[in-house]
C-alpha cells in the first residue's frame, strides 16, 4: 500500500461505487504526490472497523455507537475527523440528548419513576439509549428484558418502534407504537408532540427540538430541561444541563499508526472541491444512489478532532456511562445514592505514595489513580477513571472549560474554627529575584527565568499575561535567553535551564527538580535570575524552614520582589509588591460526584488536617516536606466555597479574563479539545 | 532514619502460602502508616496492603480475603500472611514505613515471590 494513499471502508454495493468516484475525482484535483484513496469493501461497519485495527483500511465514518465499539479493546481505534453540520461559522459537530419537561411540572431527573414518558423510537440515541443507560440502574429489577423493565418503571409510554403486544405500557400514549411518521408521536417532533399535548411528562429528545417546533420565545419558556444534578434548567441553556452530548457522526482511525494527518488531508482537500455546493460532477455530501453514502448528507463539511482528544473523551462521561449500562447491564451493588469510594487522581509516584498513605489511613474511603501530567489527571476524571484533585488555579480554568467544577478552595490564612466557611480573597503572584542583581520588572528581556509549571496561576499566567500585554506576541522563549517552565515543548530555551534528571527533563510534575513552587525558587537559587512564585515561597524555604541540601543555609534578606511600577521591595511586603492577586488552589471533580467529593474531603480533614500536630507519627493531609504533594503544604483547611461553584464565579472575571487573552498562546492540548 | 528489610518470598505453587516479614534496624512504635508493595516485571509499583499505628488495615481489592498485614512493634516487624496465592501474585514485594519523605526514592531489595501454576 502506497505510504500516502488512506484505504476508505464502504459497506455496501451503492458506498463502494461513491467511493470509487470519490477516489476517482481526487486523483484528478490531488498531485500525483499528494493523498490518494483506495476502497475497501466489508459487510458491515463493525467489519469496517475490524479491519481497520488490523491494518487492511485506514478509514471509516461512523455513528456515536459505533465509535464506542470502536474504542472498545481489542479496536481501540480514535476520532479523527468529525463531520459538521450548519454554518462554517457556527460549526454543529454535537448534539445534546435533553430531557424536556414542562414547566408548571415539579419532578426532578430522580424522581422519574410513576411518571409517562415520550420517546423518539425504541433503540435511538437521544430518546431510548441515553435516558434508558442513565436511568438503568434505577430500574425495577430483572432487568432484563429492558423493555419490560422500562413499562415498569414509567406509568405509561410512548416507544414508537416498540412491540405492543409484548410490552402494552410502552404503547400506552401511543396505541400500537407505530413506526413512521403515521404516529403522530413518532421522533423527535412526535416526543415533543406527546408532552406538548399532555400525554406525557417528559419527553426524550434532542436540544434543538424544541427551537424547531417552538419558534416563539414565549411558548418556549413554558418548558424545561431535567438536569443529571437534580436542578432545572430553561431550554437555553442546554449545554449545561442535557443527558449526554452525541458526536454526530466521526471519521475514526487507529490510534497508532493511524495515518490521521494524511486523513485529514484528503478530507480538507476534498470538502475545498467537492464540499456543498462546490462541483456539479461529484459532490461528497449527496448520496445519488442512496441515502448517507460515506457521509451524511446533511453534512456542511469537516474538523480535525484534536490530537488530544480520544474516543472517551470525544463521547464523553454521561454518554459511555449510558452506552455501557445498557450494553454490559451491571450495576454497582451500593444503592445509586451511597457515596462510593473516591479515586485521588495522584501526579507521578511521589504524589502516589502520599496518595497511598492516605488511602491506608482513610480505610480505603479514598483510592488512587496516577498520571503524568496535571492535564492528564483532568482527562480521567473528566472520564470518570477518577474523581477529583487540588488544583492551580491556572488548571482550575481548563479543567472548568472540560465540565468539571470547583468543590472545595484550600485557604491559606483562616485560623481554625472559622476556617472551613471563610472565603479567602487569595495568595500574591510574585517575581522574586536575588537581591544582589540589579534586575526591574522593566529589564528581564534576555534574562533567566524560572516557572512553577506551564499553565500554572503565579508561574505562568499571571507573568506572562502581563508580558504578553507588554511585547503583544506569544514567542516567550525568545524574550527569556533561557529558562525552566516545566511543560514546555522539549526543545525550548524554557526547558534549557530544567534539572531532570534525564527522561523526567522540564516535564510538568514532581519528578523534575525545579517544578512547583519550591522547585521554581531552586532554580533561582541554582541557575536563574527570577522566579515566578508565590508570596510565601521564600519565607518557606529560607530560615532553615527547608531543609534540603540546597535550601538549608538560605536567607529570605538575599532576595527581593519586582514591583510592575519598576521598583522592588522586601519579601515582607508582598501586599505592596506583586503581579496580581491570585484565586486559592481548589479541589475539583465531575458534577455528579460533587457533593460525595466534598462531605468526604469534609470529614478527612477533620481527622487529617492541620489539627494533627505531630506529623512525624501521624498522617497529616497537608504536609510534604515543602513539595505540595496532593494540596499545598500551607493549606490550614478546604473550605466551602458557597455561591462560588463555578469556575468562572470561583477564578473571577479578572482572572478568567486574563487567561482568556492568554488563549492564544496556549499550549494547552487539553484546552483544545475540551473547547473543539 | 530505620532501614527496612524483606524476607519470606520463595516459589509456591498456586493455592499455597507464604509469609513476608519485614525488619526495621530501629522502632516502629511511632511511624505513622507501613506497607507492602510488589512489582511484577513491567509493571508499576502498587499497593497491596497498609496498616496504620493504630492497627486499621488497608487492602488492594485483589488481595482482600486472602492477604493479611500485620505489625508487631515489639519486634520491630512489619508481616504479610499470603494465603490462596495464585499465579497473578508473582512479583517482588517491598516493605515501606512512609516516614521517609515521599519524593525520596528509598525501596529495599525486596523478596521475590513466585507462584507457579
Known amino acids: 500500500v502506497p505510504e500516502k494513499s488512506v484505504r476508505w471502508c464502504a459497506v455496501s454495493e451503492h458506498e463502494a461505487t461513491k467511493c470509487q468516484s470519490f477516489r476517482d475525482h481526487m486523483k484528478s484535483v490531488l498531485p500525483s504526490n499528494g493523498p490518494s484513496v483506495a476502497c475497501v469493501k466489508k459487510a458491515s461497519h463493525l467489519d469496517c472497523i475490524r479491519a481497520i485495527a488490523a491494518n487492511e483500511a485506514d478509514a471509516v465514518t461512523l455513528d456515536a455507537g459505533l465509535v464506542y465499539d470502536a474504542y472498545l479493546a481489542p479496536n481501540n481505534l480514535k476520532p479523527v475527523v468529525a463531520e459538521f453540520y450548519g454554518s462554517k461559522e457556527d460549526p454543529q459537530t454535537f448534539y445534546y440528548a435533553v430531557a424536556v419537561v414542562k414547566k408548571d411540572s415539579d419532578f426532578q431527573m430522580n424522581q422519574l419513576r410513576g411518571r409517562k414518558s415520550c420517546h423518539t423510537g425504541l433503540g435511538r440515541s437521544a430518546g431510548w439509549n441515553i435516558p434508558i443507560g442513565l436511568l438503568y440502574c434505577d430500574l425495577p429489577e430483572p432487568r432484563k428484558p429492558l423493555e419490560k423493565a422500562v413499562a415498569n418503571f414509567f406509568s405509561g409510554s410512548c416507544v414508537p418502534c416498540a412491540d405492543g403486544t409484548d410490552f402494552p405500557q410502552l404503547c400506552q400514549l401511543c396505541p400500537g407504537c407505530g413506526c413512521s411518521t403515521l404516529n403522530q408521536y413518532f421522533s423527535y417532533s412526535g416526543a415533543f408532540k406527546c408532552l406538548k399535548d399532555g400525554a406525557g411528562d417528559v419527553a426524550f429528545v434532542k436540544h434543538s427540538t424544541i427551537f424547531e417546533n417552538l419558534a416563539n420565545k414565549a411558548d418556549r419558556d413554558q418548558y424545561e430541561l431535567l438536569c443529571l444534578d437534580n436542578t432545572r434548567k430553561s431550554v437555553d441553556e442546554y449545554k449545561d444541563c442535557h443527558l449526554a452530548r452525541v458526536p454526530s457522526h466521526t471519521v475514526v482511525a487507529r490510534s497508532v499508526g493511524g495515518k490521521e494527518d494524511l486523513i485529514w488531508e484528503l478530507l480538507n482537500q476534498a470538502q475545498e472541491h467537492f464540499g456543498k455546493d462546490k462541483s456539479k460532477e461529484f459532490q461528497l455530501f449527496s448520496s445519488p444512489h442512496g441515502k448517507d453514502l460515506l457521509f451524511k448528507d446533511s453534512a456542511h463539511g469537516f474538523l480535525k478532532v484534536p490530537p488530544r482528544m480520544d474516543a472517551k473523551m470525544y463521547l464523553g462521561y454521561e454518554y459511555i456511562t449510558a452506552i455501557r449500562n445498557l450494553r454490559e447491564g451491571t450495576c454497582p451493588e451500593a444503592p445509586t445514592d451511597e457515596c462510593k469510594p473516591v479515586k485521588w487522581c495522584a501526579l507521578s509516584h511521589h504524589e502516589r505514595l502520599k496518595c497511598d498513605e492516605w488511602s491506608v489511613n482513610s480505610a480505603g474511603k479514598i483510592e488512587c489513580e496516577s498520571a503524568e501530567t496535571t492535564e492528564d489527571c483532568i482527562a480521567k476524571i473528566m472520564n470518570g477513571e477518577a474523581d477529583a484533585m487540588s488544583l492551580d488555579g491556572g488548571f482550575v480554568y481548563i479543567a472548568g472549560m472540560c465540565g468539571l467544577v470547583p468543590v472545595l478552595a484550600e485557604n491559606y490564612n483562616t485560623p481554625n474554627p472559622n476556617c472551613e466557611n471563610t472565603a479567602e480573597e487569595g495568595y500574591f503572584a510574585v517575581a522574586v529575584v536575588k537581591s544582589s542583581s540589579d534586575l526591574t520588572w522593566d529589564n528581564l528581556k534576555g534574562k533567566k527565568s524560572c516557572h512553577t509549571a506551564v499553565g500554572r496561576t503565579a508561574g505562568w499566567n499571571i507573568p506572562m499575561g502581563l508580558l504578553y500585554s507588554k511585547i503583544n506576541h506569544c514567542r516567550f522563549d525568545e524574550f527569556f535567553s533561557e529558562g525552566c517552565a516545566p511543560g514546555s515543548e522539549k526543545n525550548s530555551s524554557l526547558c534549557k535551564l530544567c534539572m531532570g534528571p534525564s527522561p523526567n527533563l522540564c516535564e510538568p510534575n514532581n519528578k523534575e527538580g525545579y517544578y512547583g513552587y519550591t522547585g521554581a525558587f531552586r532554580c533561582l537559587v541554582e541557575k536563574g535570575d527570577v522566579a515566578f512564585v508565590k508570596h510565601q515561597t521564600v519565607p518557606q524555604n529560607t530560615g532553615g524552614k527547608n531543609p534540603d541540601a540546597w535550601a538549608k543555609n538560605l536567607k529570605e534578606e538575599d532576595y527581593e520582589l519586582l514591583c510592575l511600577d519598576g521598583s522592588r521591595k522586601s519579601v515582607q511586603e508582598p501586599a505592596n509588591c506583586h503581579l496580581a492577586r491570585a484565586p486559592n488552589h481548589a479541589v475539583v471533580a465531575r458534577k455528579d460526584k460533587a457533593d460525595c467529593v466534598q462531605t468526604l474531603l469534609l470529614d478527612q480533614q477533620r481527622m487529617f488536617g492541620s489539627s494533627v500536630t505531630d506529623c512525624s507519627s501521624n498522617f497529616c493531609l497537608f504536609e510534604s516536606k515543602t513539595k505540595d504533594l496532593l494540596f499545598r503544604d500551607d493549606t490550614v483547611c478546604l473550605a466551602k466555597l458557597h455561591d462560588r461553584n463555578t469556575y468562572e464565579k470561583y477564578l473571577g472575571e479578572e482572572y478568567v479574563k486574563a487567561v482568556t487573552n492568554l488563549r492564544k498562546c496556549s499550549t494547552s492540548p487539553l484546552l483544545e479539545a475540551c473547547t473543539f | 532514619q530505620v532501614q527496612l528489610v524483606e524476607s519470606g518470598g520463595g516459589l509456591v505453587q498456586a493455592g499455597g502460602s507464604l509469609r513476608l516479614s519485614c525488619v526495621a534496624s530501629?522502632?516502629?512504635?511511632?511511624?505513622?502508616?507501613m506497607a507492602w508493595y510488589r512489582q511484577a516485571p513491567g509493571q508499576q509499583r502498587e499497593l497491596v496492603a497498609g496498616?496504620?499505628?493504630?492497627?486499621?488495615?488497608h487492602y488492594a481489592d485483589s488481595v482482600k480475603g486472602r492477604f493479611t498485614i500485620s505489625r508487631d512493634n515489639a519486634k520491630n516487624t512489619l508481616y504479610l500472611q499470603m494465603n490462596s496465592l495464585e499465579p497473578e501474585d508473582t512479583a517482588v514485594y517491598y516493605c515501606?514505613?512512609?516516614?521517609?519523605?515521599?519524593?525520596?526514592?528509598?525501596w529495599g531489595q525486596g523478596t521475590q515471590v513466585t507462584v507457579s501454576s
Open positions: 515501606t514505613d512512609y516516614s521517609r519523605r515521599y519524593y525520596e526514592d528509598y
Open positions: 530501629g522502632s516502629i512504635a511511632s511511624i505513622a502508616t
Open positions: 496498616i496504620t499505628r493504630g492497627g486499621s488495615t
